[in-house]
């Protein structure tokens, strides 16, 4: 049964849900965070949580500017208990098949088990297997980075091109950007889009003699990836005397399909595998992270894994009231389902994290963009926030207007590292960045009332335009520094936030049936684009678009 991990069909059946509805009506919707701070001198102390990473570094999560009080937090924790979030969490960490629609374990947490404790799936301790892949990645990445691994003309590798899409692209792209400060000897490029421009522009800037291509496709059949890989291979051969024996020195595979990998011409010694219990959007911790290990070095990649492992330990071992990802997920449910919020903003005050919101967008929306529960019934409540974000302070000059004065409630996470990797101009830039991080959260909370606006000299019809309602919730996440360990921890935090949301909504956060239909229809239409005949097999709009395209192509 799809419902073997939970004993309820809909979250709305849970007593704590009704209780929260009543609390929302009686106090939640009128709760003033500003007043809560005035009432409770210890509010910040109670509602900020500090996570200590494996290396002793710290991340502070400040939940105190959220629309909650002690009673609301207690009711949300009650909801988590009734939904058996910890039971589902423990099942995940035991390797049980909590991805019920695909009958698979969800075991990305096993990929960062650097303590090497036994972790079982279907009676098999997968820890030695995970460790072995990591050793293979270490050996390979160190050979390439040191120059011991040479291209077909004896030159060192200078560039790595990762060809993949979705989970085989977004994670490595985001992580390599975020940890650019730790990069050394190699440049890394990513090709994902089937749009020929993506591969063409990349091939313009690399040299076949010194480039290593990583083909990242679990099945080695993903249409976009294999098309791009074949284009790269044809380009490589055309530049290297059409000698297929050179491929072995310039192509590696992140895949499990040995036959297809070998057919492509890749030496299977340079094939890095991963298991069916690794979902695409959770795969940066696996062999899919090889481009990361090549870019920042294996030791830094391992620190990245250990940072995530430290959050896993926190998530599994910390009581609910102090459990940081659990609280993050509960707040998301509170805003989604009781305040009617439909979005979640993540604004990193850090240029290195500029792809972090895009990464979280896939993590959150592909996981929780579901409308059927584990009980096989349609939800009667909202799920899956629309997650968006851009780095600040850029974001302040674009969509922050709507966050401050728009008609929608947009719960927001602001992220800042206290120490910059680039403390230029005597830390002037960093201080300006930080002052905006603090000011934005404060402004969203305190707002500006009519009285203040008038006191500042505004009159007449201009007054309402300058009023800020305030009471707009933010969570401030303050790290010491964006290191590999910190980044690993931040990603794992959001993974477990997403898990918590899904557990309460009683949906399967680990499948993605929604991506299938478009793929199937694209195959059908692909064949129709190969001939010149007028198409009439679809609806009038689709027919019209296809026929116009064929005429203009």
């Amino acid at each position: 049964s799809n419902n073997s991990f939970t004993n309820f069909k809909l979250a709305t059946e849970l007593p704590a849900w009704s209780k929260l509805q009543k609390i929302y009506e009686s106090q939640g919707k009128t709760l003033s965070v500003k007043q809560e701070f005035q009432k409770d001198a210890k509010r910040f102390e109670k509602l900020n949580k500090t996570f200590t990473n494996y290396d002793g570094s710290k991340i502070l999560f400040d939940y105190s500017k959220n629309l909650v009080n002690d009673e609301i937090i207690a009711a949300l924790i009650e909801l988590a208990k009734e939904a058996n979030v910890t039971g589902l969490r423990d099942a995940m960490f035991k390797g049980e098949h909590i991805n019920s629609t695909e009958d698979r374990a969800v075991y990305h947490v096993a990929l960062r088990n650097r303590a090497n404790k036994p972790m079982y799936v279907d009676g098999v301790n997968v820890a030695p297997e995970v460790d072995s892949v990591l050793k293979h990645m270490k050996e390979f990445s160190e050979q390439v980075r040191s120059g011991e691994w040479k291209g077909y003309t004896g030159k060192k590798i200078t560039d790595v091109v990762n060809i993949g899409i979705g989970g085989s692209d977004l994670g490595p792209v985001m992580v390599t950007e975020a940890l650019k400060h730790y990069a050394g000897v190699l440049d890394v490029h990513f090709v994902s889009n089937i749009d020929g421009t993506h591969i063409a522009e990349t091939l313009k800037v690399v040299d076949p003699e010194t480039t290593l291509f990583l083909i990242a496709s679990k099945t080695f059949t993903t249409a976009e990836t294999i098309t791009n890989a074949n284009t790269a291979k044809n380009w490589f051969l055309s530049k290297t005397g059409n000698d297929p024996s050179h491929i072995a020195k310039h192509f590696a595979a992140l895949s499990t399909n040995e036959t297809e990998v070998a057919k492509f011409g890749i030496d299977t010694k340079n094939m890095f595998g991963f298991e069916s219990w690794v979902g695409g959007r959770y795969s940066v911790w696996s062999a899919i992270g090889l481009s990361v290990a090549l870019y920042i070095g294996y030791d830094n990649f391992e620190a990245f894994l250990k940072g995530a492992e430290a959050v896993d330990n926190h998530f599994t071992q910390t009581p609910l009231e102090d459990n940081i990802p659990l609280l993050g997920g509960l707040l998301s449910v509170w805003y989604n389902n009781f305040f009617g919020a439909q979005t979640h903003l993540v604004a990193p005050f850090d240029q290195y994290l500029h792809r972090f919101p895009a990464y979280l967008q896939q993590l959150s929306m592909e996981s929780n963009g579901k409308s059927v529960t584990r009980g096989n019934v349609f939800t009667d409540y909202s799920t899956g926030s629309i997650l968006f974000g851009e780095p600040a302070t850029n974001a302040q000059h674009s969509f922050f207007q709507l966050v401050h004065q728009g008609t929608k409630l947009i719960p927001s996470d602001f992220i800042l590292a206290a120490q910059s990797h680039n403390p230029i101009e005597n830390k002037l830039h960093q201080k300006m960045l930080a002052s905006n991080f603090f000011a934005q959260a404060e402004a969203l909370m305190v707002g500006k009332d009519e009285e203040q606006v008038k006191a500042e000299g505004a009159t007449g019809g201009l007054v309402p335009h300058k009023v800020f309602s305030g009471n707009r919730p933010t969570t401030s996440i303050l790290a010491q520094k964006i290191t590999p360990a910190t980044l690993g921890a931040l990603i794992a935090y959001y993974e477990h936030v997403t898990f918590t949301e899904g557990a309460i909504w009683n949906i399967n956060s680990f499948d993605q049936w929604g991506v299938e239909l478009g793929k199937v229809l694209a195959k059908v239409i692909g064949k129709e684009l190969d001939n010149s005949s007028t198409i009439s097999t679809h609806d009038a709009s689709t027919n019209g678009l296809i026929n116009q395209f064929k005429e203009w192509m």
Partner: nanobody, 118 residues
């Protein structure tokens, strides 16, 4: 606890057939490349046949090509070696080996004796 247990060996006449089995437990079987090796008295261990983790590709030593067939059943966690047209020089202890993808993680069975003699 990882175990690879070979069975099916024995005494057979020249020209006869045997089917060796190797049952694995404690490993993620479908992800392992599986091989059969053999070691005759006083000789080095040598590769006989191998099959990729996906089962799509098989390789054979020249001396068994056309006579031996390797196959796997991922539902039973078992790899087989069908040996036909056996010759006295095929006499050896046959071992199965499992290697996780292309990593160094490798497990060996204890071996099963095959004797080809009239």
């Amino acid at each position: 606890q990882v175990q690879l247990v070979e069975s099916g060996g024995g005494l057979v006449q020249p020209g006869g057939s045997l089917r060796l089995s190797c049952a694995a437990s404690g490993i993620t079987f479908p992800s392992y490349r599986l091989s059969w090796y053999r070691q005759a008295p006083g000789k080095e261990r040598e590769l006989v046949a191998a099959i990729t983790s996906d089962g799509g590709t098989t390789n054979y030593a020249d001396f068994v090509k056309g006579r031996f067939t390797i196959s796997r059943d991922n539902t039973k966690n078992t790899v087989y070696l069908q040996m036909n047209s056996l010759k006295p020089e095929d006499t050896a202890v046959y071992y199965c080996k499992a290697q996780y993808f292309s990593t160094p993680l490798t497990y060996w069975g204890q071996g099963t004796q095959v004797t080809v003699s009239s």
